[in-house]
């Protein structure tokens, strides 16, 4: 391996030995947790008796990535936090690498094989410990770090029992070979978060899937709380900095928030493209087609890369409740190609919903089942009815006196009508499938500037019910 | 017992240079990134910059990049903070912080070196 | 640079009074952390991660906020509780202060 590591690195010098002086491992126990100095020497038996090493239990290598500060960042320290909290016997291992990740991207990103044999020695040292097992071991890398978690699960002598990828790093690592990179054959199971990916310009976290599973919250690109608005306050106060680091850093936020918030679980569904998620198709638990995400994410029979969706709130806890909504629009007369904004409410026995935008993501079928995605903030508990409202939105002139003759010619229905009969809706959460129906069969009709409302009329679709992901989970 | 011990007061003239020192005890050096934080007479703190003394690593506010230079002597746990070209705007009380790179806070502070630059 | 705003910048409460300041920052942070400064004295830590006191802080001091808006309240004022208090972000460099509220005994 260090063979192999040394042509990876540009000179010489920038070899283990470099490394050795350059990586440090600081043990975090729960007995301790302010202790300073307990740092893991390979060779080095007393700092383990020293600092509580608890060789039977969990341990987890937090990996941190390319830094502009030189100093451990805060991510990190809640990262641990919270791991701590809800692993109270674990030992948590804060991987330092700061001498080599504080460089020019392109310079860190050349040390980060090294880093990884440096863990890897750690980690095959470790082994020949009474009661220590790599299946215990947990490495969590964010940015570069995942990619050195990826290196060090390939290196270490043996199979580490789970690399979680924090926003894989993505320039210098998108669609590289497997052995340059994080990749699944580097643990008994790899579970990625991507967070920042772009298909425009430079993409920070890595876009291609690199896991056994791969999670896109929000699509992976765009995370609510971090737009513009959100994050600079005033453009006059902020750089485009700033939403980078938040996009980018959300993923160890939705780690942290996995670990802290048990109660308030997120779960990701299987799809094979942002688009199809958006569009509300895919809301399946069958098969393993659901999962939990970041720490809650469980092993799964599939084989790898598969991508999942998932949409959260802007901040902690990051939950929202996703529903599919299938609504068949009928159109009585051919009315060209419509692009309706539609809004609907949702009812329940815990809450109401706010009003919720019915995304199109490409356009209306007419006289065709349209499927939608919605979601909710709150937990609306049992959904009793729906309001579904058509905005009244501004025509042309040239709109107005077409449909001004199309009523003189047919004066009881306008051009822009449709009709729907129901609306059938899938939570993702609790799997369960509802029918909601107009509550008078003859005022099914609804144009531009109106509403209706569905109550539900049918536990079911008259279809086998699929598995919930809490029982699975 | 953690303390961090600045040097004293001085009074130099503009465009001068000066450089404040602060003596780290009572804990391992190196295990502590050093942050200098700036309060002018009557008004709030600015952080200044940092650097962690186990590779000399720094980084700086844009505002002071150009106007304070930090330097650390491992040998004897001394953090140190040059400011050059002075002027009256640089009048204020210079603060010295530790920040525990696995706690993530300024936990302990500097008493504090007034700098005076008047003609 | 994230903006952290301090209401009110002075504020006197009598003894035994609850106290509340906020501190609102222009970006989102992920955690606020509040210092105390006695004239003449180097500040103290108060509080970290939003909510944490800091060792040796009295109990009637706690921590809440998240995103955009923080505060600082203490259940019932002692007269050992007048200083000014300044709030802090570490989220995005360069790290930022609010301008402070003094709080006075009435």
């Known amino acids: 391996a260090e063979e192999q590591l040394e042509g990876g690195l540009r000179t010489a010098k920038d070899g283990p030995a470099a490394a050795k002086a350059a990586v440090r491992f600081h043990l975090r126990t729960s007995k301790g947790p302010e202790r300073e100095g307990c740092y893991l020497s390979v060779g080095h038996s007393q700092p383990l008796e020293d600092c509580s090493f608890n060789m039977t239990a969990k341990t987890f290598f937090i990996i941190h990535g390319w830094t502009m500060s030189g100093m451990l960042e805060n991510w990190l320290h809640k990262l641990v936090s919270a791991l701590q909290m809800r692993e109270k016997d674990a030992n948590v291992v804060v991987v330092d690498w700061l001498p080599l990740a504080h460089q020019l991207y392109t310079d860190a990103v050349n040390s980060t094989r090294v880093v990884g044999l440096s863990v890897a020695k750690m980690l095959d040292w470790l082994q020949g410990k009474d009661g220590f097992s790599l299946g215990n071991v947990h490495l969590i890398g964010y940015s570069l770090g995942a990619h050195v978690a990826g290196f060090a699960g390939n290196f270490v002598k043996g199979t580490v029992g789970r690399i979680t990828g924090l926003d894989p790093a993505g320039p210098m690592f998108e669609g590289v070979d497997i052995h340059r990179r994080l990749s699944p054959d580097d643990a008994d199971f790899v579970d990625v978060l991507h967070t920042y990916t772009r298909s425009f310009g430079i993409s920070i976290g890595i876009q291609m899937p690199v896991g056994h599973i791969d999670i896109y919250p929000n699509g992976g690109d765009f995370q609510p709380g971090c737009g513009l608005n959100d994050v600079l306050g005033s453009i006059a106060y902020g750089t485009i900095a700033e939403v980078v680091k938040c996009e980018h850093e959300r993923a160890v936020h939705l780690f942290v928030d996995s670990l802290v918030n048990q109660d308030k679980p997120s779960f990701a569904f299987q799809c094979t493209d942002s688009n199809r998620f958006k569009k509300g198709i895919c809301l399946s638990c069958r098969k393993n087609r659901c999962n939990g995400i970041g720490y809650n994410a469980k092993k799964t029979r599939n084989k790898r890369n598969t991508k999942m969706y998932l949409k959260t709130r802007a901040g902690m806890p990051f939950r929202v409740y996703h529903y599919q909504m299938k609504i068949h629009f009928f159109s009585y007369k051919s009315v060209g190609a419509i692009e309706p904004t539609f809004y609907v409410t949702l009812y329940g026995t815990n809450a109401e919903s706010q009003v919720l935008s019915l995304e199109i993501v490409e356009q209306i079928g007419l006289n065709a089942t349209n499927t939608f995605l919605v979601y909710t903030e709150e937990d609306l508990g049992d959904l009793l009815k729906i309001k579904l409202t058509w905005e009244g939105t501004s025509r042309s002139w040239y709109d107005l006196w077409r449909e001004f003759r199309s009523y003189l010619s047919q004066p009881h229905r306008p051009e822009r009508e449709l009709s729907i009969r129901r609306i059938r809706v899938k939570s993702g959460e609790t799997q369960r499938r509802l029918t909601f129906c107009v509550e008078d069969p003859e005022k099914t009709s609804i144009a531009p500037g109106q509403e209706l409302w569905f109550y539900k009329c049918r536990d079911g679709w008259r279809m086998k019910n699929e598995t919930s992901p809490t029982v699975e989970l | 017992e953690v303390q961090l011990q600045q040097s004293g007061p001085e009074l130099l003239k503009p465009g001068a240079s000066v450089k404040i020192s602060c003596k780290a005890s009572?804990?391992?050096?190196?295990?502590?990134?050093m942050h200098w934080v700036k309060q002018s007479h009557g008004k709030s703190l600015e952080w200044i910059g940092s650097i962690n003394p186990y590779y000399g690593g720094t980084s700086y506010n844009e505002k002071f990049k150009d106007k304070a230079t930090l330097t650390v002597d491992k040998s004897s746990n001394t953090a140190y903070m040059e400011f050059r070209s002075l002027t009256s705007e640089d009048c204020a009380v210079y603060y010295c912080?530790?920040?525990?790179?696995?706690?993530?806070?300024?936990?302990?502070w500097g008493q504090g070196t007034t700098l005076t630059v008047s003609s | 640079e994230n903006v952290l705003t301090q209401s009110p910048a002075i504020m006197s409460a009598s003894l035994g009074e609850k106290v509340t300041m906020s501190c609102r920052a222009s970006s989102s942070v992920h955690y606020m952390y509040w210092y105390q400064q006695k004239s003449d004295a180097s500040p103290k830590l108060w509080i970290y991660?939003?909510?944490n006191l800091a060792p040796g802080v009295p109990d009637r001091f706690s921590g809440s906020g998240s995103g955009n808006s923080y505060s600082l309240t203490i259940s019932s004022m002692e007269g050992e509780d007048a200083a000014t208090y300044y709030c802090?972000?570490?989220?995005?460099?360069?790290?930022?202060f609010g301008g402070g509220t003094k709080l006075e005994i009435k």
């Open positions: 991660y939003t909510s």
């Open positions: 802090q972000q570490f989220t995005s460099s360069p790290y930022t």
């Open positions: 009572g804990y391992t050096f190196t295990e502590y990134t």
């Open positions: 912080a530790r920040y525990g790179n696995y706690v993530g806070y300024f936990d302990y």
